[in-house]
Interface confidence: medium
Amino acid sequence: MMTGTIETTGNISAEKGGSIILQCHLSSTTAQVTQVNWEQQDQLLAICNADLGWHISPSFKDRVAPGPGLGLTLQSLTVNDTGEYFCIYHTYPDGTYTGRIFLEVLESSVAEHGARFQIP
């Protein structure tokens, strides 16, 4: 039975040209996290595998940085980066948990960032 829940940064906004941290946190389960995938509309951005480390998709390597933690940092944001991002937690024995973040990249310099939390 899957008892866990994914907390995310929810809907967030950031300035064009800036950077943003995408973070998810899996709680309420003792399942072991074996891998976390970060995806954007069916495109794989990055993988963090418990055994093998980080893999950043070559097409995103110049604008995506691993971390902090299991999160992902997007850099040099463009308006085209606006959209849904998914953290997909592969766990044992529970299975797969998915979290959703919506990022809006603003032209304005007064982008208001959504609530953040620190991953313990």
Epitope: T34, Q35, L44, I47, N49, A50, D51, L52, G53, W54, H55, I56, S57, P58, K61, A65, P66, H90, Y92, T96
Partner: antibody, heavy 119, light 107 residues
Framework: DVQLVESGGGLVQPGGSLSLSCAAS????????MNWVRQPPGKALEWLGF??????????EYSASVKGRFTISRDNSQSILYLQMNALRAEDSATYYC??????????WGTGTTLTVSS | DIQMTQSPASLSASVGGTVTITCRAS??????LAWYQQKQGKSPQLLVY???TLAEGVPSRFSGSGSGTQFSLKINSLQPKDFGSYYC?????????FGAGTKLELK
């Protein structure tokens, strides 16, 4: 053109040492994990280990069968991957391939170099 | 370690025919499975990754399927150049392991 070319294979006595090289070209070497995979004559492929890319600090992982005897390193200025093999045994006889990995599947393979361990 | 079990070990088929090779993982690996083709005396070549995504330049007569622990590689309209050995490999954890291979021979 993306290319990997291994060299350094040959005949070695049991207990001996040998270093294999793999020259990479046609891609940004520092962006990729680089692996060694071997294949004994007429047998299956066996992953030996990898060295991570720049973003992951060039750290290494090894299979249990070679851990402590084999060492993977890389010269990023020359785009060369190395496999240092010590305390060689007859069962290490194989064709050795270097391979580039993307998300831990092997998308580019070298031509292979053959090691024979025999007295 | 995750063990990969391939079947059959060998099979023969005719040009124009269809074959299916299967691979079973000893643990759940989601869709993290790759298939390689290796011709005699040559290095392996990536055919499929993520269980069903064809590598660049691979003809559409090849198709991969499956998830979890059961996977298969299907080759339709067999061509003379398709004969050789095929290996599966999980790309999910350490150590990365291959199946023992399937030798596809001309009938």
């Amino acid at each position: 053109d993306v290319q990997l070319v291994e060299s350094g294979g040959g005949l070695v006595q049991p207990g001996g040492s040998l270093s294999l090289s793999c020259a990479a070209s046609g891609f940004t070497f520092t962006d990729y994990y680089m692996n060694w995979v071997r294949q004994p004559p007429g047998k299956a492929l066996e992953w030996l280990g990898f060295i991570r890319n720049k973003a992951n600090g060039y750290t290494t992982e090894y299979s249990a069968s070679v851990k402590g005897r084999f060492t993977i390193s890389r010269d990023n200025s020359q785009s060369i991957l190395y496999l240092q093999m010590n305390a060689l045994r007859a069962e290490d006889s194989a064709t050795y391939y270097c391979a580039r990995s993307t998300a831990w599947y092997f998308d580019v393979w070298g031509t292979g170099t053959t090691l024979t361990v025999s007295s | 370690d995750i063990q990969m079990t391939q079947s059959p070990a060998s099979l023969s088929a005719s040009v124009g025919g269809t074959v299916t090779i299967t691979c079973r993982a000893s643990e759940h690996i989601y869709s993290y499975l790759a298939w390689y083709q290796q011709k005699q005396g040559k290095s392996p070549q990536l055919l499929v990754y993520n269980a069903k995504t064809l590598a660049e330049g691979v003809p559409s007569r090849f198709s991969g399927s499956g998830s979890g622990t059961q996977f298969s590689l299907k080759i339709n309209s067999l061509q003379p150049k398709d004969f050789g050995s095929y290996y599966c490999q999980h790309h999910y954890g350490n150590p990365l392991t291959f199946g023992a291979g399937t030798k596809l021979e001309l009938k």
